[in-house]
Each structure stands twice: as C-alpha cells, then as structure tokens.
C-alpha cells in the first residue's frame, strides 16, 4: 500500500472514545506519553487528536481497481510531533516522537462502520487493529470481516470545540 501524496487530503480534530464511551487520554509521564482508556468525570475536558487523512493505493496485485483502488489512511497525533505507532512485535500501541515523513507504523487504514464510528487497521500488519484490552490500547488480530463489528476495535470520533491542537 503506497501513500499517493505527501500531504494529507484533509485533517480533522476530534476526541476519541471507545464504543462504550470511555475516553482515550494521553499523559506525559517521565518524558514519554502514556495512553489510557478511562471514564471521564462529568464536564472533564476530553483530549483531542489530530487525524490526518491520506489517500493510499492498493497494491496492484491485490486489486483490479486501477486508479479507483483507493483507501483512506490516517495518522493520529494527540500533541505536536507525537504520533500513535503500531508496535507489531509487542502487539502494543505507543506514542512516539517522529519527524516527517512518518514511518509506516504510524499509518492506519480507516474502516467506517458508519458515520463517526471507525476502526484503525495497522498498515504494517493487515488484519490487526487498534483495540481496547485491559483499559489500554493494544493491537488486536481480527480473523475475518465478520468480526469487524466487534466492540473492542470500534471507536467514536466526536468534534472538539474547546481548544486547539498545540
């Protein structure tokens, strides 16, 4: 899968929550960021994530679509210069400081179940999705498309009105 342009086609600032309405939050601890899945108190501000959407071409041997064989890839950045990365060896999702061009581990294929409900498939390990495991984000293997509706890999995107990505 090759990214067709170096610039995102659009960017979208949103808060990220699980299908069960727990918030994905990010905390700086000992000079590195930790990712948490937690219930927020009423009126507590949600962390926001900058989603950058890129167009990606299917590998030509996988698709007969030609110019139409496009997918949406996203990168997720909760704070400047940091992006979510798939660590396929550890089956973990981590925040790393990176410079552009970003490594493939920072790209995820976007799947929509419907508007504002999405799943993120690892670019570097097809069939493996960002999911929730023991109140943390992890990489979860999904065996078939029937399991794409499984709640632990579904996330909701919601607009953030309060403050800007710094």
């Amino acid at each position: 899968m090759s990214i067709t342009g170096i610039s995102p086609i659009t960017e979208y600032l949103a808060s990220l929550s699980t299908y069960n309405d727990q918030s994905i939050t990010f905390a700086l601890e000992d000079e590195s960021y930790e990712i948490y899945v937690e219930d927020l108190k009423k009126d507590e501000k949600k962390d926001k994530v900058l989603l950058s959407y890129y167009e990606s071409q299917h590998p030509s041997n996988e698709s007969g679509d030609g110019v139409d064989g496009k997918m949406l890839m996203v990168t997720l950045s909760p704070t400047k210069d940091f992006w979510l990365h798939a660590n396929n060896k550890e089956h973990s999702v981590e925040l790393h400081k990176s410079e552009k061009p970003l490594p493939d581990q920072a790209f995820f294929v976007l799947h929509n179940m419907h508007s504002n409900s999405v799943s993120f498939e690892s670019k570097t390990d097809p069939g493996v999705f960002i999911g929730v495991k023991d109140n943390h984000l992890a990489l979860i293997k999904v065996d078939s498309s029937e399991n794409l509706s499984t709640e632990n890999i579904l996330f909701k995107l919601s607009e953030t009105h309060h403050h800007h990505h710094h």
Epitope: I9, D68, H114, S115
Partner: antibody, heavy 121, light 106 residues
Framework: EVQLVETGGGLVQPGRSLKLSCVAS????????MYWIRQAPGMGLEWVSS????????YYLDSVKGRFTISRNNAENTVYLQMNSLRSEDTATYYC??????????????WGQGTLVTVSS | DIQMTQSPSVLSASVGDRVTLSCKAS??????LDWCQQKVGEAPKLLIY???NLQTGIPSRFSGSGSGTDYTLTISSLQPEDVATYFC????????FGGGTKLELK
C-alpha cells in the same frame, strides 16, 4: 473501467413490491460500501440506503425504514434494494453508487445510470 | 439530522465568468463534503471530495473550499459544458444532499 448497471424498475401499483438490482464491474466489489440514491422527477437527490462492504451494516432513510431492504451478494458483484409497500412518493429514478474508498462510508465516487420506478394506480 | 442548504437555487452566468456556488450545513461537518454535477438526462458525477480534492479526470477550473458549516464550489472560468445542476453532499453524520444549484448560461 467502473460500471454500475441498475435494473428492475417499472410501473407498480401502490402497496405492491419491486426489487431493484445493481450489477457492478471494474473494481473489487467486496471492498466497497454501496448505496441507493433516488431522484423524484424534476427534483433533487435523496440518499435512500447504504450497506457496508461485508453486508453486516445497513442504513436507511427514515421514510423507507421497515419497507425497504438493502442487501448484497459479493460473489455475484450485485447490490439489491427490495421495496415493499410502495407509495406514490417513492416514484423516482433510483441510482446505485459505490463508495469512494475501500472499507469507508465516505463519499460516492461512481453512479449508475439509474432505473425509473413509477408508483401509480 | 444535518440539513444542507444550497444557494442560489438558480444562477445565470456568461462563458468565462468566475462562478461561486454556496452550500451551508446546519452543523459542523468537518470538511466531510463533496460536490457533484448532474447534466440533464444523465447520472450525477463526482467533482470534488473532502471539500477541496479534485476527482480524477475533472478539469482544474473546478475547485472547492470551506470548513465548519460553510462550503463553496468555484468554477474559475465558466465553459458551455458546465451547464448543469450542482449538488453538495455531506457524510460527516449520515448522508445528506443539498437541494442543488441550477447553473445556466446568460
């Protein structure tokens, strides 16, 4: 080349049923969301129904919920719209459209030529 | 539900004119907006997706812009073949079309 060919339209009496088909070619059908959109004579476009790439998620315009059913057969590259209890206000050209991106409900990149459904006694 | 309002409903312009069509959403749609063109007796055709991205094969005189609730389609130099009805369409929450703008030649 992407092609979408709708069939099944025609004249039908109120309260009766009709099943529309859309045969797709030129792309990997099972990767894409598919849609039905309609246009009443001389009017604008109205989204009717959507189905995700594996057929597990379906969505409907409120006024057709419980009467229309969208389905797909990925082995035959075909999407269907079963229309029951038809009303005069369902009279329209029905277009089939494909999603712009694999696995994504965002945008419609290609449309068929449409099939006319006329509901009249 | 998100409502989409297009203005004007009819627009007359001359060949070579710069033409601007407007689309307003009832809520923020986060640039999740397309424009399509429909000529008389034909199926609609996608022109612009995600607010400002030109669909393959569409002439570069077409461009899109906007954010939040307000979006614009611009034709930099109107050509006779651009006579058509133009629809905006949002997919941020559900799927909704605007009522259309019919573009005519003066």
């Amino acid at each position: 080349e992407v092609q979408l060919v709708e069939t099944g339209g025609g004249l039908v009496q109120p309260g009766r049923s009709l099943k529309l088909s859309c045969v797709a070619s030129g792309f990997t059908f099972s990767n894409y969301w598919m849609y039905w959109i309609r246009q009443a004579p001389g009017m604008g476009l109205e989204w009717v129904s959507s189905i995700n790439n594996d057929g597990g998620n379906t969505y409907y315009l409120d006024s057709v919920k419980g009467r229309f059913t969208i389905s797909r057969n990925n082995a035959e590259n075909t999407v269907y719209l079963q229309m029951n209890s038809l009303r005069s206000e369902d009279t329209a050209t029905y277009y089939c459209a494909k999603g712009h991106y694999s696995y994504s409900s965002y945008s419609f990149s290609y449309w068929g030529q449409g099939t006319l459904v006329t509901v009249s006694s | 539900d998100i409502q989409m309002t297009q203005s004007p409903s009819v627009l007359s312009a001359s060949v070579g004119d710069r033409v601007t069509l407007s689309c307003k959403a009832s809520h923020n749609i986060n640039k999740h907006l397309d424009w399509c063109q429909q000529k008389v007796g034909e199926a609609p055709k996608l022109l612009i997706y995600f607010t400002n991205n030109l669909q393959t094969g569409i002439p570069s005189r077409f461009s899109g812009s906007g954010s939040g609730t307000d979006y614009t389609l611009t034709i930099s130099s109107l050509q006779p073949e651009d006579v058509a009805t133009y629809f905006c369409f949002q997919y941020n929450s559900g799927w909704t079309f605007g009522g259309g703008t019919k573009l005519e030649l003066k």
